[in-house]
Interface confidence: low
């Protein structure tokens, strides 16, 4: 019998040129009478010129929603009911070629074409994408809010808000033919639940959204968005109500840049330079295609990439790469963003250099992406460390640390955390070496301590960049290093002429002098420590709500002893700059640390002073007893101190603090404490400094607190921020 | 082309050392793409990965085996080596050497050597 | 401790198509391997990466994977195919290489 065939709604949203027709303010009212009319002409010459082809059949309806420069583009959609069967048939592409063709036929035809009366319609100008009935419910629900922007050479167009009596705002932009357009978004306000999408076309298409950002973005508090082209469309979605618009957008046509370069490299181990996408740290665009050609000076050196915040992957199938493609060496990679530095390193067979390339395989784009370059020696990728091959970066071996995510570092380790003899691969502590005492059998621990020596785990690099042997050699008194290094900067950690944390004791004043109380509207929040004469560094988690992400909030007492009165050598600031570490990961905790730059210097007294910063191969030894102080609470759930407290606490070896909590502590995390509990920070010690006594006497940083389980629990040690994790960050901010 | 051929002693006695050399030709152990290791085979029983290592000296052991194996590298000769220690005749089996492609995500065995047997008995 | 399992013999006839299994819980994140063993001689590579084919091996091998199981495939099965075929891959964390139990494959 007969079978009614399934017919199905296929929509489609595109743009064509008039060329005898000129865009003019009025038409981008949409209540305006000129808007209404040539909207009706334009319906009537859409819906003709396709029912002028095969398409006809299938026509069901269309809408002109918008009109732009050019002399005058139209922009429109339209539905076609077909057959479910010949549903890949009609493409897009498919489409666009068969009204192409019907317009190109009636170029020179003096024949009366309907849709011809009033339009003249540029074959070459039509573009036809594919749509859902989903975009045109988003892009009709916008409409009532609906601002079109011409923005010229050289200009930066600032947008107007959007209208806060709507619950949807539509910016459509267009710039000059052979440009692209760079949509910049800056969060004004600390907190809001608004929501932005950036499309790569004139409408809400879902298959060419470029982003979307939501909600007062903390991580990104500016946001510079690529379009492939001249044309742009950007959604508004109300969040809280407001009077104040959350965000400013302004918008500018750019240049395409070029993203070919051709390098030869130096014969030199290490950094040599940076490849980026087009205008990073902006998006990429949607159709970015960067190709990079790197020559290799010789077969002994391979090629680094070192990227900050994002890894190449495998795909284990192909689909696509959502966050950018990679092609090197023919071999397909995916980028991902991750909260972790990585390396690739693309070993080197033939002198013929490495072609490599990035393209944004979707329309979906993501931050702009940077890579330092550089070579690293085949034979030994990571001198005096090991090489972790799942990230490919270099870390230390055998200290106690699984730096690498597979703990490999870790295995098989002669001497771990220790030295090892030349002679009977004993094993001795760290401080026995070039101690003046000989310790292994032939005296190898007192060998080349007045020479620099290869760089390792444990040597201490200046700044000349050789090494030396003695570990923790900074601060001491003693140059170790050829340029005097290891003993600048060296202002640090004494503590004053003196003499809450869980089972501690009442500090005296300027016993502690880099202690931070960290405030807001008066109530202490939490404790920090002065690590340079602006600088204050704390735990990123006392910012994680979004109602503490403002500077403005927060006032950083030093020198203060008693919560509830001041004394003499107390002072106050207000704070300039709030960094949180770019890592940092609520969940995890990882990566726990932030610097806070204050409002002026500090005079430094003898109730102000800054603690010292280890370098990044300090050790400090498990089972070392060392200090945290704080105004935390006295026991789990009670109030805060009023007196600053201190207590002392063992550092425990990392495997087995990583036991006790199930494996969730990262190397950038130090644990603190005892099997039995009792002595520990607990609530309102976050951020505050965990510090270790060197035999010079000085105090050296250690950790920041950061978490654990309750507050003194037997079995449940304390865990802070790892300082020497975190350092090359410290300094690359503090300096 | 890459060759790895073992050597040493084809009977041991049970609660000795079991002692094998592994000389690669046609590639440098330095080659910084690769691990190398040991595979074991029981007369008419399956396949056993021992261990592998890292040219640096960087060695990660089965965790049956562990507390028995050593495998040690010597760059200047292109050979590393296995040591197992108190034997008994469960470790009777045929010796391979091989290299570990394990890099990434790869973790294969793509070049053996002919195998060695080796007997524990006294 | 972390197991692959193979069934310890499968049959066929020439011309006809083997397919060995191997399953194992990390295979989905895991490659598999297979390995092809005649008697007095080491394995060789047959399959890489769950199905990529090494130089030099005939196309009528070839590999799949679907969730925890992957599957050896050879068709048009000769005569010089019998032999033992091991799947082989990764714990979870890919450190620890991993041998399923091996198959024997008989040309009838």
């Known amino acids: 019998g007969y079978k009614a065939e399934v017919m199905v709604s296929q929509v489609y949203s595109g743009s064509l040129r008039v060329l005898n027709r000129h865009f003019s303010q009025d038409l981008t009212r949409r209540e305006s009478s000129a808007f209404r009319s040539e909207t009706a002409k334009a319906q009537k010459m859409l819906k003709e010129l396709i029912t002028s082809t095969r398409l006809g059949t299938y026509y069901n309806s269309s809408s002109v929603y918008s009109f732009g420069e050019g002399p005058l583009t139209c922009f429109f959609w339209f539905i076609l009911q077909i057959p479910e069967h010949r549903r890949l048939m009609l493409s897009p592409e498919v489409v666009q070629a068969l009204l192409v063709e019907e317009l190109l036929s009636t170029v020179n035809s003096s024949a009366a074409v309907p849709y011809r009366a009033e339009y003249e319609v540029d074959p070459e100008g039509l573009v036809i994408l594919e749509a859902s009935v989903k975009d045109i419910a988003a892009l009709n629900s916008t409409l009532g809010c609906y601002r079109y922007s011409y923005v010229g050479q050289g200009q930066v167009l600032r947008l107007k808000g959007p209208d806060h009596l709507a619950s949807s705002c539509l910016w459509h932009l267009q710039g000059p033919k052979d440009l692209m357009l760079k949509l910049r978004l800056e969060w004004t306000l600390a907190e809001c639940r608004d929501r932005l999408a950036m499309y790569d076309v004139a409408g809400p298409l879902e298959k060419r959204l470029i982003t979307s950002v939501y909600g007062c973005s903390r991580q990104e508090p500016v946001v510079e968005v690529l379009a492939s082209g001249a044309i742009m469309a950007v959604v508004w979605k109300k969040g809280l109500h407001s009077y104040y618009d959350p965000f400013v957008l302004s918008v500018q046509p750019v240049v395409f840049q070029a993203c070919e370069v051709n390098l030869t490299l130096d014969n030199r181990l290490d950094s040599q330079g940076v490849l980026s996408t087009p205008y990073f740290p902006s998006y990429y665009s949607p159709q970015t295609h960067c190709s990079w050609h790197l020559t290799v000076p010789s077969l002994d050196y391979g090629l680094a990439l070192w990227f900050d915040a994002y890894a190449l992957r495998r795909q284990k199938y192909d689909l696509p790469c959502t966050q950018g493609q990679w092609t090197i060496q023919n071999r397909r990679l995916c980028g991902l963003r991750i909260l972790q530095p990585y390396a690739e390193r693309i070993p080197v067979v033939a002198t013929a250099g490495i072609t490599i390339n990035f393209t944004s395989q979707i329309s979906l784009t993501g931050p702009g992406v940077r890579v330092h370059y550089g070579l690293y020696n085949q034979s030994d990728p990571c001198p005096g460390e090991f090489l972790c091959s799942v990230n490919g970066l270099c870390v230390p071996a055998c200290d106690g640390v699984k730096d690498c995510p597979n703990g490999l570092d870790e295995r098989n380790c002669v001497c771990r955390a220790t030295f090892q003899c030349k002679e009977d691969s004993t094993c001795i502590s760290l401080p026995k070496v070039c101690d003046g005492q000989p310790d292994c059998l032939n005296g190898s621990d007192e060998e080349q301590c007045q020479e620099g020596v290869p760089c390792g785990t444990f040597t201490f690099q200046c700044e000349d960049r050789s090494c030396v042997k003695k570990p923790n050699p900074q601060c001491d008194g003693r140059p170790d290093c050829r340029d005097g290094s290891d003993e600048e900067h060296c202002d640090c950690g004494l503590q004053g002429p003196s003499s809450r944390i869980v089972g501690g004791a009442v500090s005296s004043e300027g016993e502690w002098p880099w202690q931070a109380s960290l405030q807001v509207r008066g109530r202490h929040i939490c404790g920090g420590a002065l690590i340079a004469d602006r600088w204050v560094i704390t735990a990123a988690h006392c910012f994680q709500e979004d109602s503490m992400a403002s500077t403005v909030l927060w006032t950083v007492f030093l020198g203060k002893v008693w919560q509830n009165s001041r004394w003499p050598g107390e002072v106050s600031f207000k704070v300039s700059r709030l960094l949180l570490h770019p890592y940092h990961e609520e969940d995890s905790h990882d990566y726990d640390v932030a610097l806070l730059q204050l409002d002026h210097p500090v005079v430094r007294s003898a109730a102000v002073r800054p603690v010292c910063l280890p370098a990044r191969s300090h050790f400090f030894e498990p089972g070392l007893h060392c200090w945290i102080t704080g105004w935390g609470a006295l026991r789990e759930g009670g109030p805060i101190s009023n007196a600053l407290q201190k207590v002392d606490v063992q550092l425990i070896p990392q495997d087995l603090c990583s036991e006790v909590y199930r494996y969730q502590v990262t190397p950038r995390m130090l644990c603190a404490g005892y099997r039995k509990g009792k002595k520990d920070a607990c609530q309102g010690d976050s951020g505050g400094p965990l510090v270790c006594k060197a035999l010079s006497g000085r105090w050296f940083l250690a950790g920041l607190v950061s978490w654990g389980l309750g507050c003194g629990r037997p079995n449940y040690f304390g865990v802070y921020t790892r300082i020497t994790g975190v350092i090359s960050w410290i300094q690359q901010v503090v300096t | 082309q890459l060759q790895l051929q073992e050597s040493g002693p084809g009977l041991v006695k049970p609660a000795e050392t079991l002692s094998l050399m592994c000389t690669v030709s046609g590639d440098s152990i330095s080659s910084s793409h690769y691990f190398w290791g040991w595979i074991r085979q029981p007369p008419g029983k399956g396949l056993e990965w021992i261990g592998s290592m890292y040219y640096s000296g960087s060695t990660y052991y089965n965790p049956s085996l562990k507390s028995r194996v050593t495998i040690s590298v010597d760059t200047s000769n292109n050979q590393f080596s296995l040591k197992l220690r108190s034997v008994t005749a469960a470790d009777t089996a045929v010796y391979y050497c091989v290299r570990h492609n394990n890099w990434g995500l790869d973790n294969y065995f793509d070049y053996w050597g002919q195998g060695t047997l080796v007997t524990v008995s006294s | 401790s972390y197991e692959l399992t193979q069934p310890p013999s499968v049959s066929v006839s020439p011309g006809q198509t083997a397919r060995i299994t191997c399953s194992a819980d990390a295979l989905p994140d895991q490659y598999a391997y297979w390995y092809q063993q005649k008697p007095g001689q080491a394995p060789l590579l047959v399959i890489y990466k769950d199905s990529e084919r090494p130089s030099g091996i005939p196309e009528r091998f070839s590999g799949s994977s679907s969730g925890t199981i992957v599957t050896l495939t050879i068709r048009g099965v000769q005569a010089e195919d019998e032999a033992d075929y091991y799947c082989?891959?990764?714990?979870?964390?890919?450190?620890?290489?991993?041998f399923g139990g091996g198959t024997k494959l008989t040309v009838l």
């Open positions: 082989q891959s990764a714990d979870s964390s890919g450190s620890y290489a991993v």
